[in-house]
Interface confidence: low
Amino acid sequence: QPPPPPPDATCHQVRSFFQRLQPGLKWVPETPVPGSDLQVCLPKGPTCCSRKMEEKYQLTARLNMEQLLQSASMELKFLIIQNAAVFQEAFEIVVRHAKNYTNAMFKNNYPSLTPQAFEFVGEFFTDVSLYILGSDINVDDMVNELFDSLFPVIYTQLMNPGLPDSALDINECLRGARRDLKVFGNFPKLIMTQVSKSLQVTRIFLQALNLGIEVINTTDHLKFSKDCGRMLTRMWYCSYCQGLMMVKPCGGYCNVVMQGCMAGVVEIDKYWREYILSLEELVNGMYRIYDMENVLLGLFSTIHDSIQYVQKNAGKLTTTIGKLCAHSQQRQYRSAYYPEDLFIDKKVLKVAHVEHEETLSSRRRELIQKLKSFISFYSALPGYICSHSPVAENDTLCWNGQELVERYSQKAARNGMKNQFNLHELKMKGPEPVVSQIIDKLKHINQLLRTMSVPKGRVLDKNLDEEGFESGDCGDDEDECIGGSGDGMMKVKNQLRFLAELAYDLDVDDVPGNNQQATPKDNEISTFHNLGNVH
């Protein structure tokens, strides 16, 4: 073991370095002192450090550690924040356009139903938005309310436009008849299934992304313990006390210290891995009736079909309702208004699905691929931080926390540390309360994600389109009745492209909380200017 180089007889170098950390030199001894009051950088001989300097080093070391951690998670944090913002906005846009298409359908095909239909459609889609954002609304109730509200208007405006004013107090009876007589066939049930499945998945997807942000934010702002601060000080700063300004910590030593400091954080690893894999499973199942974009943008068509269904059976219904709601001056004749462009244009439908494949679903898959590259983020953190802080290559001629050594030996280092600090004790303390809380939240979301994932091999609930549809209202090859008549489909395709572009039009500056985001390069610089890294 080589003897240490002669100490700086005047503490001059230490003074000039410490000046950068703490302007004012009253804490730095002029010449080396015994240092009997030191608690972290225990001297083997005269030292250029004082107790006050040691305290400042500990503070700086913990600050550096926090910066390193934030720099390590910056890319991942930005990825999730950006995507959570993109998807939330995209889902809002989908809802808005779904509302537009539905209103356009009413306006173009059933002008006599507006403006009441606009009002009911508006309320329905407002509820859809609130549900996606986490409101406690029942999807079946939303759909029932839409059809309960629509039927009286359809009856009085389309089926019986000649009803005298005195007979218009039958709305409540008509609302009841709507369900009892299944006037819309199985379309309300079909919409309930499509909307509830697609919105549940959408909602949990957004919740999961937001929890991802919370996980990163939690670990990003961890306050490191005093014990950890001492270990970091010993690794990064105690060499200066001996006048060893150019020496770097041993890589192996850095790993031991980081594993000690981050023992609690690393416990997240198992649940983080499961989170990403569960999210991937959910995303893989987000298509057709599990894809809100597909479902909501096709709703106008399904609602259109449901009104057609009423019209096909209008004669029979008018008679039955006439008796059921027993209003005196009933004039039974059907509306003469029958739009011609009411049937599904299969060519347009197929094109719409091709377009759809290039939009939000591909963006989701792309997010999962990027997230998977961070699957080992937490287990790799100690190594990442050491590789992004100054350490000696190949563990040769480096600082082991006590002295300059030619080669780092973990065993020797451990023996030398016995009186100073027990690494094992630090590991045994268990995670911080905030880390335990975030682990519990991850466990919960993982359970939800697993519950919501579409079981393998089950693509669609085929029984849905075989129950009670008359005269081929919903054919087997029509994608669960999602899709649409020629009405408005061109608009659907344009908007799907627009949604695909939305994600990529976001600048870094547009992402909340990232206005001052430094590049990794900048972050390394800001992290290490404190370390006085002149190596």
């Epitope: 913002a85 209103n103 306006k107 608009k491 939305l502």
Partner: antibody, heavy 120, light 107 residues
Framework: EVQLVESGGGLVQPGGSLRLSCAAS????????MNWVRQAPGKGLEWVSY????????YYADSVKGRFTISRDNAQNSLYLQMNSLRDEDTAVYYC?????????????WGQGTMVTVSS | DIQLTQSPSFLSASVGDRVTITCRAS??????LAWYQQEPGKAPKLLIY???TLQSGVPSRFSGSGSGTEFTLTITSLQPEDFATYYC?????????FGQGTKVEIK
């Protein structure tokens, strides 16, 4: 009373910069998308830029892309247009306009406009 | 980009006349079209959106129709305050574009 008031126009040399502001009042500014539209002297209307209520979605006309930046401060009920590398053809009256909240897009409220003259 | 072509560019008419302005789109814009009126020295004012929906406060003599690529603005009985320039605007896809304008003058 629902109102939009633009300010910040003036004379500027080619290559120079200018920042336009639009103060909104009488409605919940944070709930509406906003636009900038311009009109060169004696010419028609040209849409310049749009920002969504949250500023997360932003669009520009090709003629200003890379030179103009739209932004908003919902706390201050203000919309901005930062115009850099100005050219002669940017001379126009600049209007801010509100995006309607209804089912269909349309610019339902307009400011009175502010004149920007780019000339050496 | 979607081009909008208005015709005519200039129109002379008298008070009480029925006036029709046409707006043609270079591609299908469904019903995503708005009409604006602009008096000299003033800001534009929204008249009609979604092809035919009258903006609140706009007199019922104004009406809009059409879909796809061909749209019309009709003023049934021209009033003195209606002499102005009229613009159509498509809001189907970005960039949002305006027609070149139709100036309605007193005959």
């Amino acid at each position: 009373e629902v109102q939009l008031v633009e300010s910040g126009g003036g004379l500027v040399q080619p290559g120079g910069s200018l920042r336009l502001s639009c103060a909104a009042s009488g409605f919940t500014f944070s709930g509406f998308g906003m636009n900038w539209v311009r009109q060169a002297p004696g010419k028609g209307l040209e849409w310049v830029s749009y920002t969504s209520s949250s500023s997360r979605t932003i669009y520009y006309a090709d003629s200003v892309k890379g030179r103009f930046t739209i932004s908003r401060d919902n706390a201050q009920n203000s919309l901005y247009l930062q115009m850099n590398s100005l050219r002669d053809e940017d001379t126009a009256v600049y209007y801010c306009a509100r995006d309607s909240s209804g089912w269909y897009d349309a610019f339902d409220i307009w400011g009175q406009g502010t004149m920007v003259t780019v000339s050496s | 980009d979607i081009q909008l072509t208005q015709s005519p560019s200039f129109l002379s008419a008298s008070v009480g006349d029925r006036v029709t302005i046409t707006c043609r789109a270079s591609q299908d814009i469904s019903s995503y079209l708005a009409w604006y009126q602009q008096e000299p020295g003033k800001a534009p004012k929204l008249l009609i959106y979604a092809t035919s929906t009258l903006q609140s406060g706009v007199p019922s003599r104004f009406s809009g129709s059409g879909s796809g690529t061909e749209f019309t603005l009709t003023i049934t009985s021209l009033q003195p305050e209606d002499f102005a320039t009229y613009y159509c605007q498509q809001l189907n896809s970005y960039p949002w574009t305006f027609g070149q304008g139709t100036k309605v003058e007193i005959k």
